[in-house]
Amino acid sequence: VEDEKPKVNQKLYMCVCEGLSCGNEDHCEGQQCFSSLSINDGFHVYQKGCFQVYEQGKMTCKTPPSPGQAVECCQGDWCNRNITAQLPTKGKSFPGTQNFHLEEQKLISEEDLGGEQKLISEEDLHHHHHH
């Protein structure tokens, strides 16, 4: 999905933002949009957002899905609206996990999100949807 070469004056895209790094916003602007899914203590954590600088998302977007984390990236206004990241499965897609509020950890590094807040706290997820 992404060009191999860094782009200096790359266009900024509007992206759907869902999850902890979004605060009260439902969108963000960046050079790439993403949709991600990871597992935390048996529960799914979904997030959507943007990489504000191309290089920040380059490695994350190239990482193949693992049993514990998947990230899908795209370029285009609102391109992540209908993307739901899925973990790889072997045959039967058991098991899934529930999207409840969690007390710990994250799925994409703070550097990837340009220093936006990433720690998942009970209070954060009580007040915000966390996909």
Epitope: V16, E18, D41, G42, F43, H44, Y46, K48, N82, T84, Q86, S93, F94, P95, G96, T97, Q98, N99, F100, H101, L102, E103, L125, H126, H129, H130, H131
Partner: antibody
Framework: EVQLVESGGGLVQPGGSLRLSCAAS????????MSWVRQAPGKGLEWVSA????????YYADSVKGRFTISRDNSKNTLYLQMKSLRVEDTAVYYC?????????WGQGTLVTVSS | DIQMTQSPSSLSASVGDRVTITCRAS??????LNWYQQKPGKAPKLLIY???SLQSGVPSRFSGSGSGTDFTLTISSLQPEDFATYYC??????????FGQGTRLEIK
Amino acid sequence: EVQLVESGGGLVQPGGSLRLSCAASGFTFSTYAMSWVRQAPGKGLEWVSAISGSGGSTYYADSVKGRFTISRDNSKNTLYLQMKSLRVEDTAVYYCANSPSWFDPWGQGTLVTVSS
Amino acid sequence: DIQMTQSPSSLSASVGDRVTITCRASQSISSYLNWYQQKPGKAPKLLIYAASSLQSGVPSRFSGSGSGTDFTLTISSLQPEDFATYYCQQSYSTPPITFGQGTRLEIK
């Protein structure tokens, strides 16, 4: 084969207690969150409670909060639901399920009847 | 709490028919919507997760679509074993996790 088997249901008087169990096999139990979902006779599905893989986080529907306690013993691959102060409206088939963004798989269910 | 409303509540159809069941959320739930089939005396069975992903082992005549607040479950050509009750379930928000009230699919 992935399997969930509930037990512990039965007839109990209002105000009484019961403990349901759900024995899991065929997967690494401790890795996954689990839930209880119930279905009153002739009615729809109602989520009751959930617990994280480690057991460190628990969640309840408002209708059972303070009366029901979910727990798990990962060494025994077993999920529990302790039910106290039971009410007639708690009468239902109780299912345990691997707790996804979707629920899958489900156990066969155990019937709890609260009646005087 | 997010409310899920299914329509119709009951539906009569014949073998071979194309059937559509709808589910509406009281607020946007992105694509975090799942569908189940339940037959009398049996546990529910997952059909579709994340709005449109077909669960392994489920026949391809079942499909799901939608995003935001409006979702559909479609059975392209109804088979005798498809007569059952169908439920939608949202997994967008923190608890409570909520189900639709169910749609009973009966033989015409």
